[in-house]
């Protein structure tokens, strides 16, 4: 060997300085007799060698690098050989820090595996080899005074948990704990833990199951959920507090706790859940009140909870076949009374005949909001209910009785806009309880089956504002009937359009007759469509050649108009514009000449 | 100092019914399980019953299902162990126990004797 | 059920010998193993739980090992007081079940 490096400390704290020093020996015949010496850090060179040849012939270079910033590096001492570097000696430098204090030590008794697992936070990197041993001793007291020791816990590399066994631990006992952390610059240690092993146990989480239905228990209520949970059997003997949670399946509602539970509740009847819904339950236990670790939340089980009767109001509405009144036509709508009112299945219509105690005879099952039926001839109320598994809503009657309640007057509708209408009308004296707004398509499109309905409940209301089902550009019929505590009205209806449309074209101008200073014009009106409103009138507009114009307005009946004191020989242009409440169109120009003087009238 | 006294044994006919009660004192009677265990003339220990810290889980051997009935009375710091539809084959020292967190039978009472004979 | 099987079911040592009684579990129980010692005419009494905890007041020669299934009550040095009879009880699940007992008599 040539060259040869010592240095100060081959670690040091990140950014201290280091000195090295390297020595050729004199023997060393190949090189030259005052060889330059040369510092590599890593690749880069560095300047600041100071060179000195000793009393025995060798030659010295004695470098101190300032701050040493890289976690490890080679350092070489090297001499330059023909063209090329040649490296004599390196050696490792490391750099980091000495260990922080572990921190955040924690430690839990597996009873399952009969060993206490003890983790700490190792805290920041320190860049060199690190190692934790795991520290414990027996004490008979609160950790003042060291029993036997335990033997150190060494974790695998890079892990920061390690397991005590149990032929190391005495259950019921103090024992201190705590991590120590040792490197190349230093070593610390974690305050210490003084733990009975028992006092931080970690136990099993019951299993959650669904009670088996006995013939005599009860059904739960809606929304209720019975459930009970089998203990873990190791654990049963320790007292336990436990808790459970639940949320629905479906929707982003979070966890709802329920708690304190003992663990011997081993049924329980949960409620105050929305009714029929899946829902997922978790339950965990914790040693009390004695100290304790709560156990993982347990599998999750999933329960349904029953649903509700049906808790609606049913507004009705009927009418009876024109040809066969004994067939009426039933209609309703559910009106919720509550947020949650029960999923609907199905309705039944039906009628108890009078004398016969019990017997209720159903007229309709439908899951529609209407039906039709036979009315029995000595029927004068049917009942309606609205039904689900678990029940009914409250029967609704309904009573068909003659119309013999006071008319409402002065029923007239207007447009909103192109998708509402208003309706309007004067109730009658004394107040009705309410109102049956119907309205569909008028003639000639009109059809009974397809009309929509809606109740006002309010019988001092003195409109309604229509909103379903209205399309611009086409007739409606509105009926209106009052209703009476056990009557109604007679019905009202009006025709009205939301939004109607200007005419498509106006008639063509034809020439009847002419003369010198006149011309007759006649013309065939279109005939009336469907969404279009009625003319209101026509305007008649004549230009001469001198672009003067003139007008003149005609009634919507008019089927011909004279323009009089016209100019002989002379042109004009002419037009027809026929007016709606919805906008007006121009047909066509008709272009004419009067007579010359001299010509004869033509007819 | 824990004490468990047990009483209420004696000779029985077959088919009659016993009633053991076990007084407790020297701990908070409350938060432990208790339990009975009897042993047979010049034979090995049996467990009978258990019973959690408030009443609620009482799990029994199959050979005394049915039959036996433990309860107890927090207030009176009491253990019974009701015993009806008796058989010879009941006959031992009925010992009763404080129960440890993992099951062990720290402190037991000194026995007394149920002798089931016509 | 689970059945604990003990032996051996008698043995015969001097004083201050070191004596070793084993339990076999037919399944699983963790450490959830106990011993007692039982004297003639007397209750029994806790020496070890949890397969290898010392109870309170018992002395330090008498300890046990083992876990899962295979277990061991180890007397270092047998004293005359310990001429009795030792049975192994599983407390991991119901319905707790003893072992058949094992006397130890006097050579």
């Known amino acids: 060997e040539c060259g040869h490096i010592s240095v100060s400390a081959p670690i040091v704290h990140l950014g201290d300085p280091i000195t090295a020093s390297c020595i050729i020996k004199q023997n060393c015949s190949h090189l030259d007799p005052e060889p330059q010496i040369l510092w590599r850090l890593g690749a880069e060179l560095q300047p600041g060698g100071r060179q000195q040849r000793l009393s025995d012939g060798t030659q010295e270079s004695i470098i101190t690098l300032p701050h040493l910033n890289h976690t490890q590096a080679f350092l070489s001492c090297c001499l330059n050989w023909g063209n090329s570097l040649q490296i004599l000696d390196q050696v490792e430098l490391r750099a980091g820090y000495p260990p922080a204090i572990p921190h955040n030590l924690s430690c839990l008794m597996n009873l399952t595996t009969s060993s206490l697992i003890c983790q700490w936070e190792p805290g920041p990197e320190t860049h060199l080899p690190t190692s934790f041993t795991l520290k414990s001793f027996k004490s008979r007291g609160n950790c003042q005074t060291q029993g036997d020791s335990i033997l150190d816990c060494v974790p695998k590399d890079g892990q920061s948990h390690c397991c005590i066994p149990r032929k190391h631990l005495l259950l019921y006992q103090n024992m201190g704990i705590w991590v120590q952390a040792e490197n190349a610059l230093g070593t610390s240690m974690s305050p210490q833990l003084c733990l009975d092993p028992m006092d931080v146990v970690k136990l099993e989480p019951p299993m959650l199951r669904t009670m088996d239905p006995s013939p005599e228990a009860a059904p739960p209520q809606a929304g209720c959920l019975q459930l009970c949970w089998e203990p873990w059997q190791p654990g049963l003997h320790i007292n336990q507090k436990c808790e459970l949670r639940h949320k629905p399946q479906r929707g982003e509602a979070s966890w709802a706790l329920v708690g304190p539970l003992p663990l011997e509740a081993l049924q329980y009847e949960l409620c105050g859940l929305l009714p029929a819904t899946a829902y997922t339950l978790q339950i965990r236990c914790i040693r009390w009140p004695l100290p304790g670790h709560w156990s993982d939340w347990s599998p999750s089980l999933e329960l349904r909870t029953t649903e509700r009767a049906p808790t609606v109001r049913l507004d009705t509405w009927w009418r009876q076949r024109q040809l066969d009144p004994r067939t009426v036509q039933l209609f309703w709508k559910p009106v919720p009374l509550e947020e949650d009112s029960g999923r609907i299945q199905g309705y039944v219509v039906s009628w108890r005949p009078s004398g016969q105690a019990g017997a209720i005879l159903p007229l309709c099952n439908t899951t529609e909001l209407s039906c039709t039926f036979h009315l029995p001839s000595e029927a004068q109320e049917v009942a309606l209910v609205a039904y689900n598994s678990a029940g009914t809503s409250r029967p609704t009657p309904v009573v068909f009785s003659e119309s013999r309640g006071p008319a409402l007057t002065r029923l007239h509708a207007m447009a909103r806009d192109p998708h509402s209408l208003w309706v309007g009308w004067e109730p009658p004296n004394p107040w009705p309880q309410g109102y049956v707004i119907e309205w569909g398509l008028g003639p000639p499109s009109a059809s009974n089956s397809n009309k929509t309905w809606r109740m006002e409940q309010n019988g001092r209301a003195t409109g309604f504002l229509l909103k379903e089902n209205i399309r611009p550009f086409q007739l409606y019929e509105i009926i209106v009937t009052p209703l009476y505590q056990d009557t109604m009205g007679p019905s009202q209806h009006v025709y009205a359009y939301s939004q109607e449309m200007a005419p498509s074209h106006a008639p063509e101008l034809h020439l009847k007759h002419i003369g010198k200073t006149w011309a007759q014009l006649e013309w065939v009106p279109e005939p009336p469509e469907l969404g279009k409103s009625p003319l209101t009138h026509y305007t008649i507009f004549w230009t001469n050649a001198q672009n003067q114009s003139f007008s003149a307005i005609l009634n919507a009946s008019s089927r011909g108009f004279v323009l009089h004191g016209l100019e002989p020989a002379s042109l004009y242009h002419i037009h027809l514009m026929a007016a709606s409440q919805a906008g007006a169109t121009n047909s066509t120009v008709l272009t004419l000449m009067t007579l010359t003087p001299e010509g004869s009238e033509l007819h | 100092e824990v004490q468990l006294l047990e009483s209420g044994g004696g000779l029985v006919q077959p088919g009659g019914s016993l009633r053991l009660s076990c007084a407790a004192s020297g701990f908070t009677f409350s938060l432990y399980w208790m339990g009975w265990v009897r042993q047979a003339p010049g034979k090995g220990l049996e467990w009978v019953s258990s019973?959690?810290?408030?009443?609620?889980?009482?799990p029994y051997a199959d050979s005394v299902k049915g039959r036996f009935t433990i309860s107890r009375d927090n207030s009176k710091n009491t253990l019974y162990l009701q015993m009806n539809s008796l058989r010879a084959e009941d006959t031992a020292v009925y010992y009763c126990?404080?129960?440890?967190?993992?099951?062990?039978?720290?402190?037991w009472g000194q026995g007394t004797l149920v002798t089931v004979s016509s | 059920d689970i059945q604990m099987t003990q032996s051996p079911s008698s043995l015969s040592a001097s004083v201050g010998d070191r004596v070793t009684i084993t339990c076999r579990a037919s399944?699983?129980?963790?450490?959830?193993l106990n011993w007692y010692q039982q004297k003639p005419g007397k209750a029994p009494k806790l020496l070890i739980y949890?397969?290898?905890n010392l109870q309170n007041g018992v002395p330090s020669r008498f300890s046990g090992s083992g876990s899962g299934t295979d277990f061991t009550l180890t007397i270092s040095s047998l004293q005359p007081e310990d001429f009795a009879t030792y049975y192994c009880?599983?407390?991991?699940?119901?319905?707790?079940?003893f072992g058949g007992g094992t006397k130890v008599e006097i050579k």
């Open positions: 126990a404080k129960l440890g967190e993992l099951g062990q039978m720290v402190y």
């Open positions: 009880q599983q407390s991991f699940k119901y319905p707790m079940t």
């Open positions: 399944q699983g129980i963790s450490s959830y």
């Open positions: 949890y397969a290898s």
């Open positions: 019973i959690s810290s408030s009443g609620g889980v009482t």
